[in-house]
């Protein structure tokens, strides 16, 4: 049997907050992989995306059934051996976010900026409110860039 750090690289162990716990593996170990040690427990076959083990696997090789994640609250997007699904992300309106695509059993929530908010980084954890211009707009605010304002005293063409 393999140690807890020797698992199939295609399989992700997942905790309850939607966080993947990645394990290291060598090619030789992967070829001989029969199951997975997880916290002293041994699983033979993973659950498919959208499901989790009904309980932790045991040392004696007892193989729990896979059960669905809670729709709209939890998900798993990879095959895994955990008894916990991943928690769906909340699009926190206090961080300027709203739901773009709802969470499903196999896909986490996708968030976007709320109207009149923008985010200019690749991964948006927080959106900022678009600037309101006092002296006119050069360029409207978009999801990825702030408003460009005219300066005081500048003439419009």
């Amino acid at each position: 049997r393999l140690s807890s750090k020797s698992v199939n690289a295609q399989v992700t162990d997942i905790n309850s907050k939607g966080l993947e716990l990645r394990k290291t593996v060598t090619t030789v170990e992967t070829q001989n992989l029969e199951g997975l040690h997880h916290d002293g427990q041994f699983c033979h076959k993973p659950c498919p995306p959208g499901e989790r083990k009904a309980r932790d696997c045991t040392v004696n090789g007892d193989e729990p059934d896979c059960v669905p994640c809670q729709e709209g609250k939890e998900y798993t997007d990879k095959a895994h051996f955990s008894s916990k699904c991943r928690r769906c992300r909340l699009c926190d309106e206090g961080h300027g976010l709203e739901v773009e695509i709802n969470c499903t059993r196999t896909q986490n929530t996708k968030c976007r900026c709320k109207p009149n908010f923008f985010c200019n980084s690749t991964v948006c954890e927080h959106c900022d409110p678009c600037t309101k211009c006092e002296h006119g707009i050069i360029k409207e605010c978009t999801l990825t860039s702030n408003t460009k304002c005219k300066e005081e005293g500048s003439r419009s063409n």
Epitope: K17, L21, K73, L90, V123
Partner: antibody, heavy 121, light 111 residues
Framework: QVQLVQSGAEVKKPGASVKVSCKAS????????MQWVKQAPGQGLEWMGE????????NYNQKFKGKATITVDTSTSTAYMELSSLRSEDTAVYYC??????????????WGQGTLVTVSS | DIVLTQSPSSLSASVGDRVTITCKAS??????????MNWYQQKPGQAPKLLIY???NLESGVPSRFSGSGSGTDFTLTISSLQPEDFATYYC?????????FGQGTKVEIK
């Protein structure tokens, strides 16, 4: 401003139940999950469970399953936490707290003032 | 459950001192480069107050003398110049895994 106001202190006999309320104001109640945290006298903080007010979905710390029941009344923007079969070890201050999410990191940004529940015969 | 151990359990310091509190997790609370650690301050008879979220983000309205750092299993809360109102108990809290857990607390007292 965002505020959570909890019900007053309670003294209960062993075996009884108690229901603590937490009234929210200053924000859209259904947009944020509500958390409950226990603090025994002179002790640290212990997470009990949470509720999504938009659909009443609950998630409990295994330790408090069967002991605590969390509910909401969206018409009054109030969350409730009921403790059953009270014992002396349930004597504690109970806090409600608003949940926030920063890229799946969940944290508690606004707290109620706490409700002291004393269990004594 | 993830166990968080804070050190020291208590410390005595003077106004103006730089104070460092550490929080060690029994397993990593990181994912994909993000750290799922939060810090709270609690004064006697009061509710906890959020200081830092996601390891290093300062909550709105919290003085900039408070800062958080760390990753994996080791995290630090630093108060750059201790003020009279900072004498309190500080808690770390992880949200990487259910049940969410808190450290046992660090009491900062006046020297």
């Amino acid at each position: 401003q965002v505020q959570l106001v909890q019900s007053g202190a309670e003294v209960k006999k062993p075996g009884a139940s108690v229901k603590v309320s937490c009234k929210a104001s200053g924000y859209t109640f259904t947009s944020y999950w509500m958390q409950w945290v226990k603090q025994a006298p002179g002790q640290g903080l212990e997470w009990m469970g949470e509720i999504d007010p938009s659909d009443s979905y609950t998630n409990y710390n295994q330790k408090f399953k069967g002991k605590a029941t969390i509910t909401v009344d969206t018409s009054t923007s109030t969350a409730y936490m009921e403790l059953s079969s009270l014992r002396s070890e349930d004597t504690a201050v109970y806090y409600c707290a608003r949940n926030r999410d920063y890229s799946n990191n969940w944290y508690f940004d606004v707290w109620g003032q706490g409700t002291l529940v004393t269990v004594s015969s | 459950d993830i166990v968080l151990t804070q050190s020291p359990s208590s410390l005595s310091a003077s106004v103006g001192d730089r104070v460092t509190i550490t929080c060690k997790a029994s397993q990593s609370v990181d994912y994909d480069g993000d750290s799922y650690m939060n810090w709270y301050q609690q004064k006697p008879g009061q509710a906890p107050k959020l200081l830092i979220y996601a390891a290093s983000n300062l909550e709105s309205g919290v003085p900039s003398r408070f800062s958080g750092s760390g990753s994996g299993t080791d995290f630090t809360l630093t108060i750059s110049s201790l003020q009279p109102e900072d004498f309190a108990t500080y808690y770390c809290q992880q949200s990487n895994e259910d049940p969410r857990t808190f450290g046992q607390g660090t009491k900062v007292e006046i020297k």
